[in-house]
């Protein structure tokens, strides 16, 4: 199809070198077909309502994805030649930095409903820069954390070394919805609840004598509890004896509730104390068997081939540790009767 | 909201891979996605679930070993199936968690598996 | 493993009457309180009403209230309309993720 009559629209993203990060392309399409094509998603239970620029349809495949290869090549489509890119109903995402994401990308409705529909697409030329060095050293991260039952704020990583009187009016989405109030470079949230993680972008323009371009930065949020105060406490055993058969085999298992940590290196091991000696054990994989927003749950066996006379004049002891203090919890095996 | 993909009619002994695609939100944030399925006329069963931001995966007891659950992108979460029965035919519905694995607070709409000879 | 016995269905209720439905679990929920209600119509996905077992979801009316604690759990609609008609599902989790389980499910009759 002939793309000389597509819209244009020009953007940049200037990538850190450092980190994990990705882009989003939102399919623009002029009003009112926009609102033909992209899909209004239904909210869940736990969100709150947010200005709902895009709806319509169904389909998942509403718009088609395209790039225009630089040597004038026809149109790929991008679902076929670009695994690292992924098409999200109307949002198309980068999932790898890199200036090989530089070009041309266009977008138009899959179904063409109207003569008028054959000339509406957007043409988005896409220019994509590693960060210099004389960027601001503190800029924001593309990854920020919002503390659940507190004030918190989501800068936007390209305007975060201005000052919010410097900084150019921002246009802010969160999961490709547009947040029409907000407009600094800096979104502040006066209680943070679950629903405000999520991918937020934020859009300013840049202009030079000869043309204007949107800078664009994804910044992808999460809701976390404060890091625990609290030493891990052990769930299992509780009790400090255990009634075993002599020559069975064993299991005794360790179960410990470690609360969450940013920086989380939980420990947990067995080990033995016998009279004046101990030593630790070398036992199978700590493993997790459960996981909240709060703390997670982990397992540590001890594995006893056959229970031996010897073993019943030993302590098994489980130690569990975080970044605050440690815990143990000691068996005595006890010979079954009867 | 969530989309679940890839039921189909298969035989017995066979594997399948189900999608579910999220669409409003990203598996980058910390989410506990769900595999629930559903026989016909009767309760729902929990498979299992991926914590998205830390990658475990939990399973349920009569789950371990034939079922495997995937993240494959920032949108898609996959579930493996190996060694289907006529047991397994149910709805096959995924759903996200934000604290747990327990308060789903958003389902897709189900995709159906049929196993038969 | 665990195992959620939930009331023995149907239940039958009035409109603008009140019904009760339980949940009692074979070893001690985690926390006490993880433990989850949901509603499921015909044809539908089940919807989440209560979490924790206690707390609200989002858009649900509180005419819908969750009580309970460890091993005995009640889900308590009062003002019963005609569009509370559906099963009703309890859910819960236990110190290992594995053990996670769904209730059998109570269905509710509107007269």
């Known amino acids: 199809f002939n793309i000389s009559g597509c819209s244009t629209k020009k953007l940049l993203w200037t990538y850190s070198t450092r980190s994990e990060e990705e882009f989003v392309l939102f399919c623009d399409l002029p009003e009112p077909q926009k609102s033909h094509f992209c899909h209004r998603n239904r909210l869940s239970p736990k969100q709150v309502p947010e200005h709902l620029p895009f709806m319509g349809s169904n389909d998942l495949s509403d718009v088609q994805w395209y790039q225009q290869p630089s040597n004038g090549d026809p149109l790929e489509d991008i679902r076929k030649s670009y695994p690292h890119i992924i098409q999200d109903k109307c949002t198309l995402h980068f999932l790898t930095p890199g200036v090989n994401n530089s070009g041309s990308y266009i977008c138009r409705p899959k179904m063409i409903k109207s003569p008028y529909d054959v000339a509406c697409c957007v043409k988005m030329i896409l220019e994509v820069k590693p960060q210099t060095n004389a960027s601001c050293e503190y800029s924001a991260s593309h990854k920020q954390d919002l503390l659940l039952g507190s004030t918190g704020s989501i800068s936007c990583p390209s305007l975060s070394c201005q000052s919010d009187a410097q900084s150019p009016a921002v246009t802010w989405y969160k999961n490709g919805k547009l947040l029409s109030v907000e407009r600094s470079n800096r979104i502040v949230v006066d209680e943070v609840y679950d629903y405000h993680q999520g991918t937020y972008v934020c859009d300013y323009t840049q202009s030079d004598t000869v043309s204007s371009w949107t800078v664009r930065a994804v910044v992808q949020v999460r809701t976390i509890v404060g890091d625990t105060k609290l030493k891990p406490d052990i769930l299992d055993p509780v009790e400090d004896t255990l009634e075993v058969e002599l020559g069975k085999p064993l299991t005794i298992s360790c179960k410990a509730r470690f609360g969450f940590e940013r920086v989380f290196n939980p420990v947990i091991k067995w080990y033995i104390k016998d009279s004046d000696l101990e030593w630790e054990v070398s036992v199978p994989e700590a493993k997790s068997i459960k996981s909240t927003l709060k703390d997670e749950i982990i397992e540590r066996n001890i594995i006893l081939e056959k229970v031996t006379q010897r073993d019943l004049r030993r302590k098994f002891v489980c130690f569990v540790q975080n970044s605050i203090g440690n815990t143990t919890q000691s068996v005595q095996l006890k010979e079954k009767r009867g | 909201s969530l989309e679940e993909s890839g039921g189909d009619l298969v035989k017995p002994g066979a594997s399948l891979t189900l999608t579910c695609t999220a669409s409003?939100?990203?598996?980058?944030?910390?989410?506990?996605m769900s595999w629930v399925r559903q026989a016909p006329g009767k309760g729902p069963e929990w498979i299992g679930c991926i914590v998205t931001g830390r990658g475990n995966t939990y399973y349920a007891n009569w789950a371990k070993g034939r079922f495997t659950i995937s993240k494959t992108s920032s949108t898609t979460v996959t579930l493996q199936m190996t060694s289907l029965t006529a047991a397994d035919t149910a709805t096959y519905f995924c759903a996200r968690g934000s604290s747990d694995e327990i308060a789903l607070d958003l389902w897709g709409q189900g995709t159906l598996v049929t196993v038969s000879s | 493993a665990a195992v959620l016995t939930q009331t023995p269905s149907p239940v039958s209720a009035a409109v603008g009457g009140t019904v009760t439905i339980s949940c009692q679990s074979s070893q001690n929920i985690y926390n006490k309180n993880q433990l989850s209600w949901f509603q499921q119509k015909p044809g539908q996905p089940p919807k989440l009403l209560i979490y924790e077992a206690s707390k609200l979801a989002s858009g649900v009316p509180s005419r819908f209230k969750g009580s309970g604690s460890g091993t005995q759990f009640t889900l308590t609609i009062s003002d019963v309309q005609c569009d509370d008609a559906a099963t009703y599902y309890c859910l819960g989790g236990y110190i290992s993720s594995s053990d996670t389980t769904f209730g059998g499910g109570t269905e509710v009759v509107v007269k």
């Open positions: 409003g939100f990203s598996f980058t944030s910390t989410y506990w």
